[in-house]
Amino acid sequence: FPQDRPFEDTCRGNPGHYYDKAVRRCCYRCPTGLFPTQQCPQRPADCRKQCEPDYYLDEAGRCTACVSCSRDDLVEKMPCAWNSSRVCECQPGMFCAVSVVNSCARCFFHSVCPAGMIVKFPGTAQKNTVCEPASPGVSPACASPENCKEPSSGTIPQAKPTPVSPATSNASTMPLRGGTRLAQEAASKLTRAPGSPSSVGRPSSDPGLSPTQPCPQGSGDCRKQCEPDYYLDEAGRCTACVSCSRDDLVEKTPCAWNSSRICECRPGMICATSATNSCARCVPYPICAAETGTKPQDMAEKDTTFEAPPVGTQPDCSPTPENGEAPASTSPTLSSLVDSQASKTLPIPTSAPIALSSTGK
């Protein structure tokens, strides 16, 4: 449209803006590392950090892993969105005995009310079935008058779920009498990351709870106990150890009771985008530091961006191939740094410019 030309030229003359012909507007160019929250950003506030698939942007502006609902006893209640985690809940017919942020660490089958009791409140994903005594002549659930008497203590007995895995679900039809349900409030808050083992839902002891035996004097075993692959953080919370299961990572330090596993890039690679106790993006070690916009040592230490050299440049620190072209691995292509986006295990993108050379090298 000819009438757009002056506006378009004015806009193009401003390095901080670009003209989007599709919407015929001048748009604010988000700085490297930030991504627009709308089609045509108008101001810096319209730009935010972008996260990899299966990660979301938390309140602090960090890319955080969405919880995984891959365990057999969990279902996805809410999907992973750009600004909120996936939310998991227990499968139908189960309730959460030990809740964790956006998920459940332990699901149990809903109890069946014993003879003489009737369902007061049906079980939900959060609560177990609540039973109450059946009044004589009110409910056909009373098999005999004895079962329908009020309890002498005046309390309402509740079925206590038997900790069983889904594989032994028949055990849940034998609930214990007179107990109370496991309180969710008493459960420790765990943060479960993708890749943590499926055994999390079926441990031998309650996660985050102290040993049931009284502490032997002088024993060091009275500290809070976390699930396997979880550690006790500074705030006393059971937190998931990071996973080093990605092909480009190796374990540097194992997951301990009070410290996370630490991952680092495998030999021959450097960290382009660091993450807590791990590396979000490993890239092949360049021929030399002069070839990238960021020094390798910087990459290993802080969240930074990887910038390829201008197209056609060749660093002086390594022999140039006979044809004068740089090796394919040294100058990223259209998506060589992001072709892993389809993988659900990879965190945080570099969001930095990558070179697109007409040679494809």
Epitope: T37, Q39, P53, V311, P332, L337, A355, L356
Partner: nanobody, 123 residues
Framework: QVKLVESGGGSVQAGGSLRLSCAAS????????MGWFRQAPGKEREWVAR????????YYADSVKGRFTISQDNAKNTVYLQMNSLRPEDTAMYDC????????????????WGQGTQVTVSS
């Protein structure tokens, strides 16, 4: 400076096929997208198709779904638009655009544009 160069346009009979290419050079953002727009004389610019180059996710306008296919060749930094079963109403100037994926959406910022390639479909 990002440069987008389109090619592959031309004249074809209705029902025929064409393959447009958009070669990118220079810098472009890593979490990026490339797509095609078209504009027929006297008509509004119309979005045709888009590919998110990192994930390979593709999106199409309803008017071209099932007939057009967008793809990429990372080694050549090129995006293609394979156009089959062409119709006279597909006649337009086809522009390649590139930019960044808008956070939490399936739209592109279209920060960079090529010069366009003409496609003419005769009945």
């Amino acid at each position: 400076q990002v440069k987008l160069v389109e090619s592959g346009g031309g004249s074809v009979q209705a029902g025929g096929s064409l393959r447009l290419s958009c070669a990118a050079s220079g810098y472009i953002y890593s979490s990026n997208c490339m797509g095609w727009f078209r504009q027929a004389p006297g008509k509004e610019r119309e979005w045709v198709a888009r590919i998110h180059t990192g994930s390979g996710s593709t999106y199409y306008a309803d008017s071209v779904k099932g007939r057009f296919t967008i793809s990429q060749d990372n080694a050549k930094n090129t995006v293609y638009l394979q156009m089959n079963s062409l119709r006279p109403e597909d006649t337009a100037m086809y522009d390649c655009a590139a930019g960044r994926v808008v956070l939490g959406a399936v739209v592109c910022t279209n920060e960079y544009w090529g010069q366009g390639t003409q496609v003419t479909v005769s009945s």
